[in-house]
């Protein structure tokens, strides 16, 4: 029978008695930076080329005895998970291994850097097809390791890394915290986050997605035909490296941004039991389990978006938090969230020639998050239109006035500390979907975009009685680009997008009276691109 | 541990040279920063990655590394350049005393310095 992990990542249409999806990643080369490996294991024989690269520290302890099978165990297993004949994800992928971890599974940041440099030089000397680099290791936060990963990613290499097995915020570890790297957490057969001894998978905003990482049967270095179960975020990352190899083999021109968006899009949504994560990390941690796309082609028509959370701003009065999209992505909307509810909103602003999303803390607030909605929108021309606070009692409003520009997101930012506490709610005038409406004391920012065939619509869901959470989702074929709360709901903690659903969170309802001020309205902006759909049909 | 003495035999005791002047003092207003792992047991003091500014050429990296060795030698310190980076990041890996960090941070082209640290199989 198919091992549980391969079944989990396989779309139903591929599920047969044997796991044999089309095209096994044969156009892709996967580099593995790990322990030494047993390259003559029947699972990976002829598939893995052991490079002459080795940079490892001495083993600790005077009584340590090097035993080949122990030295090779981690790397052999991972090579098998990526491309193994029987238990591999991308059975056609070829691999190259670099030894950066010693027999105890320990390495150094400097050794890893030199390994990444070796890959870059190899790429320059002999350019091949798409490259995936698997980094099944973690250390403390390292500016230099993250910088090296960024450079390699900008050279067109896809880096996949383990989130870490420390049951902690992945942002505290490297390379997991590097934004350019695809960071993978681990789940088990019950779609629970993996527990490992007293610890377990890392979590948080630096994790891109999860993948099977417990009780994974793969090649064992004990003998050339042996198999063994291993667990960890390394195993999870190896699944995603294999999926990435499959996707890149089917579409070799995919950029890192496109690949990441596809990985997110085709993941299983909302299957992880979030109760395992610390309460303050649940909203930040993606509830996504990686899966292969149902077909290798035809995803190009979709408008892909993802949600990017900033680091926490910290509690000082003027503290701000910034969320950024990847270089190839467009920032289509910006929202903010504060657990205390004390915030001064958010705004989109230019930074280094690119739009970023900045959230503002308020006096007495415990801090804010900025939430960017980052999308793939080819040939897009986006700008931000701002209206300063209005004098009129009807509130502030701004719309997209340029010909052919559509509204993709609304943000509002205010200087007064407790906006809306004593003010009547502002009602959105009906029949004006292409504008953002806000409090008269807030400046309102509209994200307006022009792109071939782009069309957007506003969708609202209001609840008259107070509720801790109000949601509104975009229907099939439409993608959520903007998520905000209708002004006038003073107890709103913030708004954010989860997959294709706009979530507006409010303070604990027990503290709020059920007056009209208790009303909460979630506003979603849903878009689609007819141009992308047509282009896709023409290809087929 | 057995290799340690051997390693130090190879260390270069660089002599004072014409390169040890102030011809390329760091630009005004830019201060290089020092970083180290927040998890103490994972720190590897004595080995440092010196990261140079983005557009630094390989020849400048080598020259900066030699300058560090020369200036360290004048103060009676042994240093060893373990690797010169180019291709991804400009810089070099150096084995030296932590006492020399202040000196290294003032070298021309230096963006930041990071103490080496451990990484682990996950």
């Amino acid at each position: 029978s198919i091992p549980w992990n391969l079944e989990r990542i396989t779309p139903p249409r591929y599920r047969a008695d044997e796991y044999q999806p089309p095209d096994g990643g044969s156009l892709v080369e996967v580099y593995l930076l790990d322990t030494s490996i047993q390259s003559d294991h029947r699972e990976i024989e002829g598939r893995v080329m052991v490079t002459d690269f080795e940079n490892v520290p001495e083993e600790d302890g005077t009584r340590f005895h090097r035993q080949a099978s122990k030295c090779d165990s981690h790397g052999t297993h991972l090579a098998g998970v990526v491309s193994g004949r029987d238990a591999g994800v991308a059975k056609g992928a070829s691999m190259r291994s670099l030894r950066v971890l010693n027999c105890q599974g320990k390495g150094t940041v400097s050794g890893t850097l030199i390994g990444l440099e070796f890959i870059r030089k190899s790429q320059l000397v002999q350019p091949v097809g798409p490259l995936v680099v698997l980094l099944p290791l973690a250390g403390g936060y390292s500016r230099v390791l993250n910088a090296a990963c960024q450079r390699l990613a900008r050279a067109g290499v896809v880096l996949v890394t383990a989130a870490g097995n420390f049951r902690d915020d992945a942002c505290l570890y490297s390379p997991a915290s590097a934004p350019e790297v695809i960071t993978v957490g681990a789940t088990n057969a019950q779609d629970q986050p993996v527990t490992l001894g007293t610890l377990g998978t890392n979590f948080g905003r630096c994790v891109d997605l999860f993948a099977p990482g417990e009780d994974i049967i793969g090649a064992s270095s004990d003998c050339s035909t042996c198999f063994v179960s291993q667990s960890g975020t390394s195993q999870a990352a190896a699944h995603v490296a294999g999926i990435a190899a499959m996707m890149l083999s089917a579409e070799p021109e995919l950029t890192l941004a496109e690949l990441r968006q596809r990985l997110i899009h085709f993941s299983a949504k909302d299957v992880i039991n979030e109760a395992w994560f610390p309460e303050d990390q649940r909203v930040l941690t993606p509830n996504l389990v990686a899966a292969l796309p149902p077909s290798t082609h035809g995803a190009g028509w979709q408008l892909f978006c993802r949600t990017v959370w900033s680091a926490h701003s910290g509690p000082t009065r003027m503290a701000t938090a910034v969320a950024r999209c990847a270089p190839d992505e467009e920032l289509l909307s910006c929202s903010s969230f504060s657990r205390s509810g004390k915030r001064r909103g958010e705004r989109m602003e230019a930074q280094g020639g690119k739009l970023v999303c900045r959230a503002h803390n308020a006096f007495g607030g415990e801090g804010v998050y900025a939430i960017a909605r980052c999308c793939l929108l080819p040939q897009a021309n986006c700008s931000v239109h701002t209206a300063p606070p209005a004098e009129a009692s009807m509130g502030t409003r701004v719309h997209c006035h340029q010909q052919g520009h559509v509204l993709t997101g609304c943000s509002s930012h205010w200087e007064v500390e407790d906006l809306g506490t004593h003010k009547p709610p502002v009602l959105r005038p009906r029949g004006q979907p292409n504008q953002c409406v806000g409090h008269r004391e807030a400046s309102i920012h509209a994200s307006c975009c022009h792109a071939p065939g782009l069309e957007c619509k506003v969708k609202e869901h209001g609840i008259p009685a107070p509720q801790e959470q109000v949601t509104v989702a975009c229907e099939e074929g439409w993608t959520l680009t903007g998520c905000s709360a209708l002004p006038g709901t003073s107890h709103v903690l913030g708004a954010y997008a989860v997959d294709n659903t706009c979530v507006v969170r409010s303070r604990d309802v027990s503290t709020t009276g059920s007056t009209s001020e208790g009303a909460v309205t979630a506003v979603a902006i849903c878009c689609r691109s007819r141009h992308l759909a047509q282009a896709s049909q023409e290809l087929q | 541990q057995e290799d340690e003495d051997g390693d130090y035999e190879e260390l270069v005791l660089a002599l004072r040279s014409e390169e040890d002047g102030l011809a390329e003092a760091p630009e005004h207003g830019t201060t290089a920063t020092f970083h180290r792992c927040a998890k103490d047991p994972w720190r590897l003091p004595g080995t440092y990655v010196v990261v140079l500014k983005e557009e630094t050429h390989l020849s400048q990296s080598e020259r900066t590394a030699r300058r560090l060795q020369a200036q360290a030698a004048r103060r009676g310190y042994l240093t060893k350049i373990l690797h010169v980076f180019h291709g991804l990041l400009p810089g070099f890996l150096v084995k030296m005393s932590g006492d020399l960090l202040e000196l290294a941070l003032k070298l021309p082209h230096v963006d930041y310095i990071e103490e080496d640290s451990s990484v682990f199989a996950q």
Partner: antibody
Framework: EVQLVESGGGLVQPGGSLRLSCAAS????????MSWVRQAPGKGLEWVAN????????YYVDSVKGRFTISRDIAKNSLYLQMNSLRAEDTAVYYC???????????????????????WGQGTTVTVSS | DIQMTQSPSTLSASVGDRVTITCRAS??????LAWYQQKPGKAPKLLIY???SLESGVPSRFSGSGSGTEFTLTISSLQPDDFATYYC?????????FGQGTKLEIK
């Protein structure tokens, strides 16, 4: 279907020897630790011994150390228990079982995470009596 | 060696009842605990591993909890098929010990 089938049980005199076998089918035999567990008539379960995937590590309950030897033949998908110097208190039904567990890395250490015995044979009876 | 003590030794209950069996370890075993069900003349069957993880194919009325030294097996609504003997088992450094068993019988 995953199956374990024990054989080799029987009546033996105290001080005698027996060799139990366990044939595995439908499982990747070499992927798992394997155990022998026994159950004396009317009593509870007692773990006897286990062996690593490649046979390189073996562990025994104190009462059988030096008398029993666990081994495996990966090529034959078989597990064995050689029992010497048998005593009356060794009388029991002997089960072979698959130990399900997983390895994971800690900070510079390689650890085993045990789940439980998820596949069992039907048992073979050993009677030690004069 | 770590000793495992199960209580009660015998438990009488009726179909539909919620029953709890306790297992105590003589020293901390973290979550290294499994629960088994055994019917007369049959081999044991794994129900719960890692103290609280349900083995695949086992009905969801079975649940496990606890860590350290105190563990419980709960059957939320007893079914006729559940009358059997239940064993807990600890794992420590590649050696195992079982509890003495709890016989669950019809009241």
């Amino acid at each position: 279907e995953v199956q374990l089938v024990e054989s080799g049980g029987g009546l033996v005199q105290p001080g005698g020897s027996l060799r139990l076998s366990c044939a595995a089918s439908g499982i990747t035999f070499s992927s798992y630790w394997m155990s022998w567990v026994r159950q004396a008539p009317g009593k509870g379960l007692e773990w006897v011994a286990n062996i690593k995937q490649d046979g390189s590590e073996k562990y025994y309950v104190d009462s059988v150390k030096g008398r029993f030897t666990i081994s495996r033949d990966i090529a034959k998908n078989s597990l064995y228990l050689q029992m010497n110097s048998l005593r009356a208190e060794d009388t029991a039904v002997y089960y072979c079982a698959r130990d399900r567990g997983t390895y994971y890395y800690g900070i510079g250490s390689y650890n085993y995470y045990y789940y439980g015995m998820d596949v069992w044979g039907q048992g073979t009876t050993v009677t030690v009596s004069s | 060696d770590i000793q495992m003590t199960q209580s009660p030794s015998t438990l009488s209950a009726s179909v539909g009842d919620r029953v709890t069996i306790t297992c105590r370890a003589s020293q901390s075993i973290s979550s290294w605990l499994a629960w088994y069900q055994q019917k007369p003349g049959k081999a044991p069957k794994l129900l719960i591993y890692k103290a609280s993880s349900l083995e695949s194919g086992v009905p969801s009325r079975f649940s496990g909890s606890g860590s350290g030294t105190e563990f419980t097996l709960t059957i939320s609504s007893l079914q006729p098929d559940d009358f059997a003997t239940y064993y807990c088992q600890q794992y420590n450094s590649y050696s195992y010990t079982f509890g003495q068993g709890t016989k669950l019988e019809i009241k």
